[in-house]
Amino acid sequence: MVPPPENVRMNSVNFKNILQWESPAFAKGNLTFTAQYLSYRIFQDKCMNTTLTECDFSSLSKYGDHTLRVRAEFADEHSDWVNITFCPVDDTIIGPPGMQVEVLADSLHMRFLAPKIENEYETWTMKNVYNSWTYNVQYWKNGTDEKFQITPQYDFEVLRNLEPWTTYCVQVRGFLPDRNKAGEWSEPVCEQTTHDETVPS
């Protein structure tokens, strides 16, 4: 009896959908695996007789529920199928946006770049897919614990009237208000402000 794959899960970030599993202990030899997806009542092979423990399902439609399954194989024997269901538009993890930060005196000027949909040739981004897409920004004085959050209305934001000659850290994430779903935070970018531009009277 061939044991089934273990810990079967979907690892999906920005619609790059990788089904992953672990090979069970099997004394007779090395196992191979076949992974399939359901397409209108028929299961279609995606990865056949692979020695890998993952399979790329990124071509599946972003919309709708998909049934995926994987089994282990050895010679003419095979395990039972392990099934999972997956809805990319609901389940994919929203990766961190890009961010450009420029210091102008006592202001930080930020521009945000929505994460690209993985593995497509064109420049479609997660913002295209989700109509309610917005950004959350949090910033803080470097070395302090107090963080401030803002929700920019556009793909850019300016933090004004900051303390001069002070290092501020900023990070951004995507947020979907209609789903109450937050993406991953970008790595913090820390920049030092310069002088206060106000002219003494």
């Epitope: 397409s39 279609q44 972003k62 593995n119 064109e122 295209n128």
Partner: nanobody, 126 residues
């Protein structure tokens, strides 16, 4: 939300021609990968012709050289020109779309398209 509406089906003699249309709503039509599928009575739905957002096309072996898929981004419409029709082309024809997609995956399976029309009937008699 994308809405698709097929038209142009009908009855034709073997050897004749038909042109199917699929009107799509949405202002990002140029970003769609699209396809035509068909389902004959008692058979599974099968892919017929596909066009990616970059305009590249693919066909099922059974229709290669007889059918031509195209799309007019200005009119938000997908077409299937069917020539030299055969009785075995008789089926309900459906158009399908996947927004924000490109030619990266050469989509041709039903599970790779998220939006579907209601279908238009094509009947070819001998």
């Amino acid at each position: 939300q994308v809405q698709l509406q097929e038209s142009g089906g009908g009855s034709v003699q073997a050897g004749g021609s038909l042109r199917l249309s699929c009107a799509a709503s949405g202002d990002t039509y140029s970003s769609y990968c699209m396809g035509w599928f068909r389902q004959a009575p008692g058979k599974e739905r099968e892919g017929v012709a596909f066009i990616d957002s970059d305009g590249s096309t693919r066909y099922a072996d059974s229709v290669e050289g007889r059918f031509t898929i195209s799309k007019d981004n200005a009119k938000n419409t997908l077409y299937l020109q069917m020539n030299s029709l055969k009785p075995e082309d008789t089926a309900m024809y459906y158009c399908a779309a996947e927004p924000y997609c490109s030619g990266g995956y050469h989509r041709k399976e039903m599970a790779e398209f998220g939006y579907w029309g209601q279908g238009t009937q094509v009947t070819v008699s001998s």
